[in-house]
Amino acid sequence: QSPIFGPQDVSSIEGNSVSITCYYPDTSVNRHTRKYWCRQGANGYCATLISSNGYLSKEYSGRASLINFPENSTFVINIAHLTQEDTGSYKCGLGTTNRGLFFDVSLEVSQVPEFPNDTHVYTKDIGRTVTIECRFKEGNAHSKKSLCKKRGEACEVVIDSTEYVDPSYKDRAILFMKGTSRDIFYVNISHLIPSDAGLYVCQAGEGPSADKNNADLQVLEPEPELLYKDLRSSVTFECDLGREVANDAKYLCRKNKETCDVIINTLGKRDPAFEGRILLTPRDDNGRFSVLITGLRKEDAGHYQCGAHSSGLPQEGWPVQAWQLFVNEESTIPNSRSVVKGVTGGSVAIVCPYNPKESSSLKYWCHWEADENGRCPVLVGTQALVQEGYEGRLALFDQPGSGAYTVILNQLTTQDSGFYWCLTDGDSRWRTTIELQVAEATKKPDLEVTPQNATAVIGETFTISCHYPCKFYSQEKYWCKWSNDGCHILPSHDEGARQSSVSCDQSSQIVSMTLNPVKKEDEGWYWCGVKEGQVYGETTAIYVAVEERTRGSPHINPTDANARAKDAPEEEAMESSVREDENKANLDPRLFADEREIQNAGDQAQENRASGNAGSAGGQSGSSK
């Protein structure tokens, strides 16, 4: 008895596809060994057609795949575009040779069934409309026309020209003639359901002189498209239901027992399990739309269906499209924190992984918004200006070659709580979702800047100090000047570093920055922060106003700018930092498109990209003390 198990008999029809699952015992060796699918020849030799080592035979080129699911102890062989030549005996197995552990599978591919010569075959998907064509001779031009459905020997009338309609076809069937045609009538049946399938007879006239036509209607359940995705990656369901439902509400649902539970629809419904990681995007006016889900979890695997109906819910007899999603736990996407916590007035540093092979790709950070279908306006990117309301408190630090970039957000308020996405214009699977939770601060921040009302005078020397606690003693301290394209690190002086590393005086740990002489362009936001290598930690921000020596009134009241970061009550903080929404950039839809479509994702690009390490003081008049 073989420990490998699978379907003994598989049958299909020409042009169709099959998906054969083979089960193997759950052992470490089995999970990692070669999986194969071979065809048994008359000579007893089993010729490999496809294997998990990457081998693909000529006859399977472009139409087959073999995917291992070690977490389920299964592998799946998908074969498309079947022909009768595919009929035969096969083996699915494990091992370095085709003589190891295997299971015998018989595959039979038959022709699409034929009917008597006068039978017209109509093949339609569930929810669609069929138009049955009925020809008749001139002698029956004024006779009664009808369509009936065969049930055993009987033929039950569906519709006739006396305006009779069978109750189960009410509002779905119409009988009509086109233009001046005298030899043909038509019957439309819309919102097709599985039970509509069968043999129909249309008739013009009565008795022996009647004209009859046979029609075989096949109503197909949508064959699910198989999607294989890695854990923590993203998936896009592209849904094209046709023009006839262009104006109806759209939905994506997940099959659960006998129901299909709506995950998202265009009427605002959304499953809480997908909060923060789902977007529904209309594609055009013909009813095409896509649903993107990021941060895939093991439990996201299953059968999905998209559809359209005015209720935004699944309804029998309405068109649907289906997928089966597999989530592979052997993921190339690293595990990163899904929840980041911060406190008001503090900061967070969020590490965003990306495909290390695409270090030159454009990096973005966007804020997922729940309204309607979900949207994710870009807040910062390597070639995108920081959005209004985030000036002076948001920066993206690229770390080329490390497979990650860091986004720092400081001067946090409770309004910053929510979901954020890390994404690039490259490999669309590498989209990660982070939930930011901001709580009210209960103690003083770790980093404090003095003086808090920072006003520098042109031509003079200006020094600003950042006090840090002993726990940051061994970390690198830095000052940087914030600009729309990052935060450029300045030369600074760590006074705490002069002390013995054994004792640490909490009151004298200071890193200071000096502007000498102060210039007008020195005005702006400065950050004091700590980091260890490429790992960024806490930051704090201060606005430095610059004024003329002669004038008494500064360019900007520094108290106002820095109050925003330190002591402003929530309402004020919101008022001063959130501007009108009209210029808010929505995420370029191309970032959510098929990889082929992603071209110029950074449309709001500046000419120069933000320097990833922000290592130069270029143009600043900063100097070491």
Epitope: F5, P7, Q8, D9, V10, S11, S12, I13, N16, S17, V18, S19, I20, Y23, P194, L220, E221, P222, E223, P224, K255, K257, E258, G302, H303, E316
Partner: nanobody, 127 residues
Framework: EVQLVESGGGVVQAEDSLRLSCAAS????????MGWFRQAPGKEREFVAT??????????YYDDSVKGRFAVSGDNTKNTMNLQMKGLNLEDTGVYYC??????????????????WGQGTQVTVSS
């Protein structure tokens, strides 16, 4: 309410044949998987055969003990399934249960891969 009803059980002689049927009612959709399990007195419920439908393809699974003797067939548009049993022997005695699922997740040999179950029909093979 979903109901699975088995029929066709009975008492037969060794080497005889029997045909079991299962019909599902109360469903507004087509099933994707229907299977047969059996339970002999004092023993665990064990897998016999399963039929799966996906698109226009059909997949049939059998336990090694019935391969070549039993044949499963069915029509998912009618939510019906049959089990043609030939060459019956004493070990085939037991209550035969019909099981069904709207999707084809999980290993078809495991009872947990089925959501709906019938009451069972008794098959007794005598010598």
């Amino acid at each position: 309410e979903v109901q699975l009803v088995e029929s066709g059980g009975g008492v037969v002689q060794a080497e005889d044949s029997l045909r079991l049927s299962c019909a599902a009612s109360g469903l507004s959709f087509s099933l994707s998987r229907m299977g047969w399990f059996r339970q002999a007195p004092g023993k665990e419920r064990e897998f016999v055969a399963t039929i799966e439908w996906s698109g226009r393809s059909t997949y049939k699974y059998y336990d090694d003990s019935v391969k070549g003797r039993f044949a499963v067939s069915g029509d998912n548009t009618k939510n019906t399934m049959n089990l043609q049993m030939k060459g019956l022997n004493l070990e085939d005695t037991g209550v035969y249960y019909c099981a069904a699922n709207p999707n084809n997740y999980g290993d078809p040999r495991t009872p947990g891969a089925y959501q709906y179950w019938g009451q069972g029909t008794q098959v007794t093979v005598s010598s």
